[in-house]
């Protein structure tokens, strides 16, 4: 039984045109605007593109078994076909400016058409012959042709106003088209060429389609579907009246899906996509970004990429000329997308969403999600803000900053927390990079009004601050090892700059034209960075060879950006972490001559295997407990008394600055201040009795030291002085008597 | 007017090489999909080869696969088929024909043939 | 995959012949027939299912069923006698382009 089907925005109808059982609403459930409209017989589902939802969905023609097959990065997708050889879907989005393929089921999607068009609107396809055709809508609308896998594109109908409709009579050989401009019907052959004109007296035909000797098309101002043979135009029948705005038209019947390709059997024995082209028969496609094996037939992932977010959506990106530049990820309940990073041995996508507070991680095509790091530990009463991360890809860790707590944590790849490894009293770190291969971490410090740019080992230790002038909010960082640089963006001086990674050598590398740099990342020889103000993404040869060249623009709310370059498995495997961590139980890092120590987060003290991290012993309360080492108790006295006495010189770390009625010695000592400049050294470096200016009065003696004392007590063979000089040059011939 | 006319047919030895040319004029070459055609004197007509319109698609008949190369040059409006390794067998009037105003399959459009002689 | 003609058949002038065409590739593919006079190039006369370029009449038509072609000429005039061959698609799936053997037509 032949079927019209026809979408009117909010619902899809179908009219038996042998029955005329008339205008039977199929039940399908959402849809807001329906537009495009397709089938595959042999399954009995219809397909139809929604452009409010912006979404491509299918269902059984009961109704039954409706699912969204295509989700994420369609705008206005308004054109919409079944491949019912190959089993794929195609579409053209006149917001994106883009045609795309994927299998029926929405996997394997590929970006076939990118360049140069302009609106693409309606779409057919050609599939025994391997031909698909469009229409454009844009400032020279036109009808084109390309091969079904995007090559050998050749304009077909130049001189034509907004077609829309288009629909191949595959029995007959010719093209049928609406045109929106003149009000035409009008017909072709494959070429383009032996234009005929179907009809030339309707007010505003729209939708189209053919069925044996008719075709079947929409009026947007009779709001009608009308019927005439399909040569002459004559025999016209009203098949429904009173319809608004119906958007696409189609007749469901087996005549208009037959024919035979390679790509029917076994898909071509393609792995992924089978596609129709001419002569050839067909050729096997891959997934956007994906590559082709020697095989011809079998894909490959990308492994050299970049990645870059928006608020609600990430985002491939590979730097070729025959790929389409970018798509978005099939990864859903994104709400907030604040920091991205990428494990590529995995090949897990790990973000920090910000509005759920979590950090989460993904498969790129969206499978084997999973929350890493939740918004909350309720037993602990500790509520967590993520703002950065960054992957130890050997250590298989994740070091993160968090706005609420102020600390650079450490979580495990599957989720267990390993500690915090940073911590301070007035410490805001925010951007962070690790550096594994050397053992560092880098990270912004937004101290009030003192920002820094510090480093540190993985462990938190051997803390030292870059840089802490010439800044603002140095916002985003990025660091190439194998150049041994280090960049940095700040959003308040709207620069970007670099140094070596030990801080030498900073240099400004631009400083003109940025507004609002949110995300950094090196990528071969250049720098990348995003601009969230201006929505673009622009990168800088480090070579200095090429400058700076923008790479994409228009793309709103963006967040971040990240490099992934191909794994060195070899290269990977002789990082003496990568094996079991380096046999630690926590930190591992690497020492200057390549091999490893063990180390611990800030709440745990390494035992003494030199392996596992252990609770700290208890101390009494007059001792201070050291964080790791051999020694575990020393006096609390000894506590920031400019000595370490902690192997890991814990106890001179974070020591509080003194209070007003206090002196501060050099090593950061409190004394209390009274005892300052009195003559005794305090301070157990002896800072306080340094650059004394003391005025000894008239009955006192001005010891060599500063020193004041009764005059009485010169020479009197007892030693009032602190460094003897009282008894010193008063008896020739003897030595001062000892003091009682 | 619409026509195609090959060129370049000859006796040549067994072993030897000829490169076959087809000129089109009077319509768009560079939207039609191109093949030869071969007929042995006396016999019915052989698909030899055919090339896609962009020149992207190729395929060869299994008896000349390897041994012959089609190209074409579309700013020329001109078809080729280089002949290499010719046999005995090879020996044809060769058209060349255009395809594409309905299919890639339906020749719409032929030459009047180039005799192509391989003979000792 | 092959395509089976007869190699001969003859019709008195103005009766209707019958041209037949067999092979697998015709379940999957339409044929085309070409008419081909000596010394001359082949001249499609029938593509698709029962299409008839400009310029050819409307005595030659074309059929299928099955892995079976026809071309029928209604009426057949004296110019119609010449070989006759049918074509089609490969459906073995190496993109091959198949010619029948050829009929010839002889009109008496």
């Known amino acids: 039984e032949a079927f019209l089907l026809f979408s009117r925005r909010a619902d899809i109808r179908r009219i038996s045109l042998e029955t005329n059982n008339n205008n039977v609403a199929i039940p399908l459930t959402g849809v807001k605007e329906a537009s495009a409209l397709d089938f595959d017989v042999t399954d009995n589902r219809i397909y139809w593109t929604d452009i409010s939802l912006k979404t491509i969905s299918r269902a059984f023609m009961n109704g039954s078994a409706l699912e969204h097959v295509v989700e994420f990065g369609l705008d206005y997708p308004e054109g919409m076909a079944v491949d019912w050889l190959g089993k794929n879907l195609y579409w053209a989005d006149t917001g994106t400016n883009r045609i795309e393929v994927s299998k029926l089921d929405g996997q394997h999607r590929q970006v076939l058409v990118w360049k140069d068009l302009d609106s693409p609107r309606a779409l057919a396809l050609d599939p025994a012959e391997g031909f698909m055709y469009w229409t454009e809508w844009g400032g020279k609308p036109k009808i084109d042709r390309a091969a079904m896998d995007g090559s050998e594109r050749t304009t077909l109908v130049p001189n034509v106003g907004r077609a829309n409709g288009l629909t191949i009579d595959y029995a007959k050989r010719r093209l049928y088209w609406t045109d929106l401009d003149t009000n035409l019907i009008e017909s072709s052959n494959m070429l383009g060429l032996n234009r005929e004109v179907i009809a030339d007296d309707l007010p505003h035909p729209f939708g189209l389609t053919q069925y044996q000797d008719y075709i079947y098309w929409t009026d947007w101002s009779r709001r009608s579907i009308e019927r005439a043979n399909k040569t002459s135009g004559q025999n016209r029948t009203i098949i429904q009246g009173h319809l608004d705005y119906v958007m696409d038209i189609l007749v469901f019947h087996s005549s208009r899906q037959s024919g035979w390709n390679e790509c029917a059997s076994s898909n071509g024995h393609c792995s992924h996509l089978c596609l129709a082209v001419p002569v050839g028969g067909f050729v096997c496609g891959c997934p956007a970004h994906y590559s082709l094996n020697a095989d011809n037939r079998t894909c490959s992932a990308p492994t050299t990429f970049l990645l870059f977010s928006q608020k609600s959506a990430i985002n491939r990106m590979v730097i070729d000329e025959q790929q389409s530049p970018d798509i978005i990820l099939p990864i859903h309940s994104l709400r907030n997308v604040r920091a991205i990073d990428y494990d590529p041995l995995d090949k897990q996508l790990y973000w920090i969403d910000s509005r759920q507070n979590m950090i989460r991680k993904a498969q790129e095509d969206g499978s084997q999600g999973f929350t890493v790091v939740v918004s909350s530990v309720p037993s602990q009463n500790l509520e967590i803000q993520p703002y950065d991360l960054s992957i130890d890809i050997y250590s298989r860790y994740i070091y993160w900053t968090c706005e609420a707590t102020n600390v650079i944590n450490v979580t495990r790849l599957d989720g267990r927390s390993v500690g915090v490894v940073l911590k301070g009293e007035q410490d805001r770190p925010r951007a962070v990079v690790v550096n594994p291969e050397k053992g560092y971490m880098y990270f912004t410090n937004l101290q009030e009004r003192s920002p820094k740019i510090e480093r540190a080992a993985l462990d938190g230790t051997e803390r030292e601050v870059l840089f802490f002038s010439g800044l603002s909010k140095p916002i985003a960082l990025a660091l190439d090892s194998r150049l041994g640089k280090l960049f940095w963006a700040d959003s308040d001086l709207r620069r970007i700059e670099s140094s070596d990674l030990s801080g030498a050598n900073r240099i400004v590398l631009e400083d003109s034209n940025i507004l609002q740099p949110v995300g950094l990342t090196v990528f071969e020889n250049w720098l990348y960075w995003i601009d969230k103000q201006q929505q673009m993404i622009e990168k800088i040869d480090m070579t200095g060879r090429e400058g700076r060249t923008k790479v994409q623009a228009r793309i709103a709310q963006l967040s971040d950006i990240h490099a992934v370059k191909e794994l060195n498995l070899q290269e990977y495997r002789q990082h003496p972490c990568a094996q079991d961590n380096g046999g630690c139980s926590h930190i591992c890092l690497v020492k200057g001559d390549g091999t490893t120590r063990c180390s611990c987060p800030m709440h745990l003290v390494l035992l003494q295997d030199e392996l596992s991290c252990g609770e700290p012993p208890t101390c009494s309360p007059q001792q201070f407990t050291c964080f790791t080492g051999e020694i575990d108790c020393i006096p609390v006295a000894w506590r920031c008394d400019g000595f370490t006495e902690c192997e890991d010189h814990s106890d001179e770390l974070n020591c509080p600055v003194c209070s007003e009625s206090q002196f501060q010695c050099a090593s950061g000592q409190c004394i209390d201040g009274a005892l300052r400049c009195n003559g005794d050294a305090n301070c157990q470096d002896k800072s306080d009795e340094k650059n004394c200016e003391v005025l000894c009065l008239i009955d006192q003696f001005r010891c060599a030291n500063g020193q004041c004392i009764g005059k009485h007590k010169k020479c009197d063979h007892n030693v009032d002085c602190s460094d003897k000089s009282d008894e010193l040059d008063c008896y020739p011939t003897e030595e001062p008597a000892p003091q009682a | 007017q619409v026509q195609l006319q090959e060129s370049g047919g000859g006796l040549v030895q067994p072993g030897g090489s000829l490169r076959l040319s087809c000129a089109a004029s009077?319509?768009?070459?560079?939207?039609?999909?191109m093949s030869w055609v071969r007929q042995a004197p006396g016999k019915g007509l052989e698909w030899v080869s055919s090339?896609?319109?962009?020149?992207?698609?190729?395929s060869y008949a299994d008896s000349v696969k390897g041994r012959f190369t089609i190209s074409r040059d579309n700013a020329k409006n001109s078809l080729y088929l280089q002949m290499n390794s010719l046999r005995v067998d090879d020996t044809a009037v060769y058209y060349c024909?255009?395809?594409?105003?309905?299919?890639?399959?339906?020749?719409?459009?032929w030459g009047r043939g180039t005799l192509v002689t391989v003979s000792s | 995959s092959e395509l089976t003609q007869d190699p001969a058949v003859s019709v008195a002038l103005g009766q209707t012949v019958r041209i037949t065409c067999q092979g697998d590739?015709?379940?999957?593919?339409?044929a085309s027939w070409y008419q081909q006079k000596p010394g001359q190039a082949p001249v499609v006369v029938i593509y698709?299912?029962?299409n008839r370029p400009s310029g050819i009449p409307d005595r030659f038509s074309g059929s299928s069923s099955g892995n079976s072609a026809s071309l029928t000429i209604t009426g057949a005039q004296a110019e119609d006698e010449a070989d006759y061959y049918c074509?089609?698609?490969?459906?073995?799936?190496?993109?091959?382009?198949?010619f029948g053997g050829g009929t010839k037509l002889t009109v008496l």
């Open positions: 590739s015709l379940r999957s593919f339409d």
């Open positions: 090339i896609s319109s962009g020149s992207t698609y190729i």
């Open positions: 074509s089609s698609r490969d459906s073995r799936g190496n993109h091959l382009a198949l």
């Open positions: 698709g299912e029962n």
């Open positions: 024909a255009a395809a594409g105003g309905a299919s890639n399959w339906y020749f719409d459009l």
């Open positions: 009077g319509f768009t070459f560079s939207s039609y999909a």
